[in-house]
């Protein structure tokens, strides 16, 4: 039905093409493994069209199946560093509402300094996605090395 | 508005679904770190629907947000080779027009022989994407190991 | 033309937005390198909207260009394990019909325990995709570590 309305020239938002690409703002305080994200036209090539940021975490505004993708690069890192400080792990999941909490995507760095992956997953309005980086190494904030995004694919 | 015209049965191109998937043609001459790509029906499973190739580099024909993805595998490579020849780095960026030059995506191989990633980024008509591979190792030209593509996602 | 029909309020399936995200069910018997997948609402966050499973392999129902993505994580794995058991390789390809058999995507684990990649590729109705994992290490069945999916992008 959403697509049936195309003839009425409704704005793209009504077509359901929510999309966001975020850059790293900062890491969390003590005992908080979350990465905090930022996005918007004043911040280079990051943007939010539909989803919103809630205290640095991405909140979904439209039900549907989404492509979620992420790349995280560790700063001042070599394969020796990465293996010496193993395990360093990144997990992307729904962290709220608590009733829907689940890990969607998980990767370890092993002897590498970058992880990158993507997956399709159903998300609902109000779902907040968190990206947890556990370990002793800090991520790069360079916008071409660390980024996180979602793309609405279909209802 | 583009979608509002769907009822007029315009060709898909007018809907803005530009997409391309390229295979490696060759590497650049001395001092040129760029990879040169090729695509088209005569070349197996690569294709260009909208974007064009300009001297082996991908040129965008439609403004919008794109999903850019790449995989590069180093030829005759083992983890020992990769670490011995470290750093080998791949960067994808807008290389022209010069005023819009920026790195979009960067990865190092460390002890691995393949990198793969993807990201959402705004691109404008006329933007040319370059993929720079720096280091002493050469990429595989196997079409299932090394490829580069873009997909228009929304205006 | 498919999009021109939007005004008739046809179901999404007629718009061609076929999509699937699968989780690992089991590995094949001796001499069968294939991974066997499962998906559906009863299985957490996996789903099939359009494509079907045929004995654990993904069969395409609609011609078009697809984004194919995969992540496979090896179970009980460290970088030492991965390098000691090298080569462990994952290949995604069309395995039937035999006349269209081709490898689409190939990655080796080297010193890592996870591979993840994605690519655009034309697929035709009836194409069956197989994911072959060769080597002595077994994949994790955790749904956030090993998954495989496709998304219809355009005709």
């Amino acid at each position: 039905q959403r697509f049936a309305q195309a003839q009425q020239q409704l704005p793209l938002e009504s077509l359901g093409w929510d999309v966001a690409e975020l850059q790293l703002n900062h890491t969390g305080p003590q005992q908080d493994p979350r990465l905090y994200w930022q996005g918007g036209p004043a911040l280079g090539r990051s943007f939010l069209h539909g989803p919103e940021l809630d205290k640095g975490q991405l909140r979904i505004h439209r039900d549907g199946i989404y492509m979620v993708h992420i790349q995280v690069t560790l700063a001042i890192c070599s394969s020796t560093t990465a293996s010496r400080h193993h395990p360093t792990t990144l997990a992307v999941g729904i962290c709220s509402p608590a009733s829907r909490s689940i890990s969607l995507l998980r990767l370890s760095f092993h002897q590498g300094c970058t992880i990158a992956s993507q997956r399709l997953t159903p998300l609902a309005r109000g779902d907040t996605l968190c990206t947890n980086l556990t370990g002793t190494l800090l991520p790069s904030r360079n916008t071409d090395e660390t980024f996180f995004g979602v793309q609405w694919v279909r209802p | 508005q583009r979608f509002a015209q769907a009822q007029q049965q315009l060709p898909l191109e007018s809907l803005g679904w530009d997409v391309a998937e390229l295979q490696l043609n060759h590497t650049g001459p001395q001092q040129d770190p760029r990879l040169y790509w090729q695509g088209g029906p005569a070349l197996g499973r690569s294709f260009l629907h909208g974007p064009e190739l300009d001297k082996g580099q991908l040129r965008i024909h439609r403004d919008g947000i794109y999903m850019v993805h790449i995989q590069v595998t180093l030829a005759i490579c083992s983890s020992t080779t990769a670490s011995r020849h470290h750093p080998t780095t791949l960067a994808v960026g807008i290389c022209s027009p010069a005023s819009r030059s920026i790195s979009l995506l960067r990865l190092s191989f460390h002890q691995g022989c393949t990198i793969a990633s993807q990201r959402l980024t705004p691109l404008a008509r006329g933007d040319t994407l370059c993929t720079n591979l720096t280091g002493t190792l050469l990429p595989s030209r196997n079409t299932d190991e090394t490829f580069f593509g873009v997909q228009w996602v929304r205006p | 033309q498919r999009f021109a029909q939007a005004q008739q309020q046809l179901p999404l399936e007629s718009l061609g937005w076929d999509v699937a995200e699968l989780q690992l069910n089991h590995t094949g018997p001796q001499q069968d390198p294939r991974l066997y997948w499962q998906g559906g609402p009863a299985l957490g966050r996996s789903f099939l909207h359009g494509p079907e499973l045929d004995k654990g392999q993904l069969r395409i129902h609609r011609d078009g260009i697809y984004m194919v993505h995969i992540q496979v994580t090896l179970a009980i794995c460290s970088s030492t394990t991965a390098s000691r058991h090298h080569p462990t390789t994952l290949a995604v390809g069309i395995c039937s019909p035999a006349s269209r058999s081709i490898s689409l995507l190939r990655l080796s684990f080297h010193q890592g325990c996870t591979i993840a990649s994605q690519r655009l590729t034309p697929l035709a109705r009836g194409d069956t995709l197989c994911t072959n994992l060769t080597g002595t290490l077994l994949p994790s069945r955790n749904t956030d570590e090993t998954f495989f999916g496709v998304q219809w992008v355009r005709p």
Partner: antibody, heavy 119, light 107 residues
Framework: QVQLVQSGAEVKKPGASVKVSCKAS????????MHWVRQAPGQGLEWMGW????????SYAQQFQGRVTMTRDTSMSTVYMELTRLRADDTAVYYC????????????WGQGTLVTVSS | DIQMTQSPSSLSASVGDRVTITCQAS??????LNWYQQKPGKVPNLLIY???NLETGVPSRFSGSGSGTDFTFTISSLQPEDIATYYC?????????FGQGTRLEIK
């Protein structure tokens, strides 16, 4: 504003140990690596290692491995660098520094602590 | 470890001169290179980060360029207050390493 305040100068005998402190203020202490860099009299800069104040994890330069220990007290927003088995060529000014790297903007240094090793 | 070789180790120039210092890395370090100024008895001060970006508050007569293994630091018009030692520093790979320094004095 960001400030890194180090402990005062020390005079030590060869074979002894020294522990230098660095108190941080004006920023999120656990959000950045704290580095230690030393400079011998009339010489260049030499990186010793970093500590992640959030996790306590460390990375040391090879030449200091086994002799240096970096620790932190998050309640005091303070990091410590202890160097053992001191030699005459360890005589240097020791700096704690929140160095710029990989988009983590702001480059701040403590005032330096002169450690003199002499018999 | 990555060796950073600076040249020259010292140089003398006149006020208003264009001054160039080079830094060569023993292996490719992308653009992960910073330039510091250290005046006698003072702490180092970051001038240029990531090879070519001017740190906030630093005069525009300072600039940097290069990528990979070869980098250049330039003062377009030398001022008396620029008398200092200049260091390049890489952070691509641990350990972080500094060049040996270039001592700059006025003729």
């Amino acid at each position: 504003q960001v400030q890194l305040v180090q402990s005062g100068a020390e005079v030590k005998k060869p074979g002894a140990s020294v522990k230098v402190s660095c108190k941080a203020s004006g920023y999120s202490f656990t959000g950045y690596y704290m580095h230690w860099v030393r400079q011998a009299p009339g010489q260049g800069l030499e990186w010793m290692g970093w500590i992640n104040p959030k996790s306590g994890g460390t990375s040391y330069a090879q030449q200091f491995q086994g002799r240096v220990t970096m620790t932190r007290d998050t309640s005091m927003s303070t990091v410590y660098m202890e160097l053992t088995r001191l030699r005459a060529d360890d005589t240097a000014v020791y700096y704690c520094a929140r160095l710029y790297y990989s988009g983590w903007y702001g480059d701040y240094w403590g005032q330096g602590t002169l450690v003199t090793v002499s018999s | 470890d990555i060796q950073m070789t600076q040249s020259p180790s010292s140089l003398s120039a006149s006020v208003g001169d264009r001054v160039t210092i080079t830094c060569q890395a023993s292996q490719d370090i992308n653009n992960y290179l910073n330039w510091y100024q250290q005046k006698p008895g003072k702490v180092p001060n970051l001038l240029i980060y990531d090879a070519s970006n001017l740190e906030t508050g630093v005069p525009s007569r300072f600039s940097g360029s290069g990528s990979g293994t070869d980098f250049t630091f330039t003062i377009s018009s030398l001022q008396p207050e620029d008398i200092a030692t200049y260091y390049c520093q890489q952070y691509n790979n641990p350990p972080i390493t500094f060049g040996q320094g270039t001592r700059l004095e006025i003729k």
